[in-house]
C-alpha cells in the first residue's frame, strides 16, 4: 500500500535512455505520443515531473515478517498527464487523469546508481518500462538477469528550478 496520498518529494528531470537517446513527448491529434530519439544539439530536452511515494512491501513478500519500504514514482511530462502502463497492450501511454491516480501510473523505482534507474510496474511485478523499436514499451524481465538489461535503464538529469508548475 502507498503510504499517504501525497508524494514525499518531487523533482524535475529530463529522461534519456542508457544509450543517451531522449524521451520526448508530442501532442498529436489531442493526445500525447512518446518518442525515443536522438536530439538535435540545440533542442531543449523535455522535462518530466517525478513524484516520489513511499510504499510498504506486504510482510509476506519480505519473507521474515518485516515490512520493507520502497519508492514508487509517477511521471508527468505535462500538467494533468501521466505515464501509464497498459499491461494488455504491453505499452506505455500518456493519459489525462485526475487524482487519486490509478495504480497503472505508479512504478517501483530501482536505482542502478543515482541517475541510472529503471521503472517496474506496480500492477505487474517483473514488468518494466523499456525501449523497443524507438518507442517505450513494457518489457518482462527475468530477475535472474539482475535487472541489468540496458533497454530498461534510463538516465535522469535533474533540472533545478521551481518544478511544481510545469507545462
Amino acid at each position: 500500500s502507498i503510504t499517504g496520498i501525497s508524494p514525499i518529494t518531487e523533482s524535475l528531470a529530463s529522461l534519456s535512455t542508457y544509450n543517451d537517446q531522449s524521451i520526448t513527448f508530442a501532442l498529436e491529434d489531442e493526445s500525447y505520443e512518446i518518442y525515443v530519439e536522438d536530439l538535435k544539439k540545440d533542442k531543449k530536452k523535455d522535462k518530466v515531473l517525478l513524484s516520489y511515494y513511499e510504499s510498504q512491501h506486504p510482510s509476506s513478500e519480505s519473507g521474515d515478517g518485516v515490512d520493507g519500504k520502497m519508492l514508487m514514482v509517477t511521471l508527468s511530462p505535462t500538467k494533468d498527464f501521466w505515464l501509464q502502463a497498459n499491461n494488455k497492450e504491453h505499452s506505455v501511454e500518456l493519459h489525462k487523469c485526475e487524482k487519486p491516480l490509478p495504480d497503472q501510473a505508479f512504478f517501483v523505482l530501482h536505482n542502478r546508481s543515482f541517475n541510472c534507474v529503471s521503472f517496474e510496474c506496480k500492477t505487474d511485478p517483473g514488468v518494466f518500462i523499456g525501449v523497443k523499436d524507438n518507442h517505450l514499451a513494457l518489457i518482462k524481465v527475468d530477475y535472474s538477469e539482475n535487472l541489468g538489461s540496458e533497454n530498461i535503464l534510463f538516465k535522469l538529469s535533474e533540472i533545478l528550478e521551481h518544478h511544481h508548475h510545469h507545462h
Partner: antibody
C-alpha cells in the same frame, strides 16, 4: 528486531590488512543496498563505500579507492569490508549502515551497527 | 563531488529553546538530504530523510526543510536528550557526503 552487528576491528600496523564483517538480521538483507561509514576519533562522519542489494554495484570514496573492497554474502546476511594498505588516517570507528529503501540509493541510512574500532599504528 | 557545509559548528542552548541548524550544498539538488543525531559513544540515528520526512519514532519537535542548496533542521523546543551532534548528508550522488556536524551543547 532489525539489527546490524559489526566485528573484525583491531590494532594493525601501517601497510597491513583487516577484514570487517557486519551481520544483519530482522530484514530481507538482499533487498537493500548497504554502506560502510567511518568516524575518526573526535571527528565527523565519512562515507566510505556502498554496495547494491545484489552485490553488482559498488562505489567508493576517493580516499579508499583501490585499497578497500566491499562485498556481501546474501545467503549469510553478511556484509564485508576488506581493508588493505592501511594508513594511520584510516584509524576510525567503522559502522555498517542500511539504506532506507529497497532497490534504491535515495533516502538515508535508517539502521546502523554499533561500530567496530580500527586502529592503525606501529 | 557535492560538499556539505554545516553551520554553526556548535551552539549553546537551554532546554525549551528553539534551535536551527543549516546545511549548504556546493551544488543544488532537489531534496534527497538526511539529518542524523549522534550521542557520544553511540551510532548515529536517522531523524529526517528526503529533506523533510520524519523518520518513524522521531519526535515531531524535529523538523526538516529546504531544497536546492539550502537545508535546515529545526528543533522547536529543545529537550535534555537532544544535546548531541547533528549531521546532514546528501543522498543525491556518489560519493555520499556528510556535513561537518553541529554540536548542540547545554548553555
Amino acid at each position: 528486531e532489525v539489527q546490524l552487528v559489526e566485528s573484525g576491528g583491531g590494532l594493525v600496523q601501517p601497510g597491513g590488512s583487516l577484514r570487517l564483517s557486519c551481520s544483519a538480521s530482522g530484514f530481507t538483507f538482499s533487498s537493500y543496498a548497504m554502506n560502510w561509514v567511518r568516524q575518526a576519533p573526535g571527528k565527523g562522519l565519512e562515507w566510505v563505500t556502498a554496495i547494491s542489494g545484489s552485490g553488482g554495484g559498488t562505489y567508493y570514496a576517493d580516499s579508499v579507492k583501490g585499497r578497500f573492497t566491499i562485498s556481501r554474502d546474501n545467503s549469510k546476511n553478511s556484509l564485508f569490508l576488506q581493508l588493505n594498505s592501511l594508513r594511520a588516517e584510516d584509524t576510525a570507528v567503522y559502522y555498517c549502515a542500511k539504506q532506507t529503501y529497497t532497490s534504491s540509493w535515495y533516502g538515508g541510512f535508517d539502521i546502523w551497527g554499533q561500530g567496530t574500532m580500527v586502529t592503525v599504528s606501529s | 563531488d557535492i560538499q556539505m557545509t554545516q553551520s554553526p559548528s556548535s551552539v549553546s542552548a537551554s532546554v525549551g529553546d528553539r534551535v536551527t541548524i543549516t546545511c549548504r550544498a556546493s551544488q543544488g539538488f532537489s531534496s534527497w538530504l538526511a539529518w542524523y543525531q549522534q550521542i557520544p559513544g553511540k551510532a548515529p540515528k536517522l531523524l529526517i530523510y528526503a529533506a523533510s520526512r520524519l523518520q518513524s519514532g522521531v519526535p515531531s519537535r524535529f523538523r526538516g526543510s529546504g531544497s536546492g542548496t539550502d537545508f535546515t533542521l529545526t528543533i522547536s523546543s529543545l529537550q535534555p536528550e537532544d544535546f548531541a551532534t547533528y549531521y546532514c548528508q546528501q543522498a543525491n550522488s556518489f560519493p555520499l557526503t556528510f556535513g561537518g556536524g553541529t554540536k548542540v551543547e547545554i548553555k
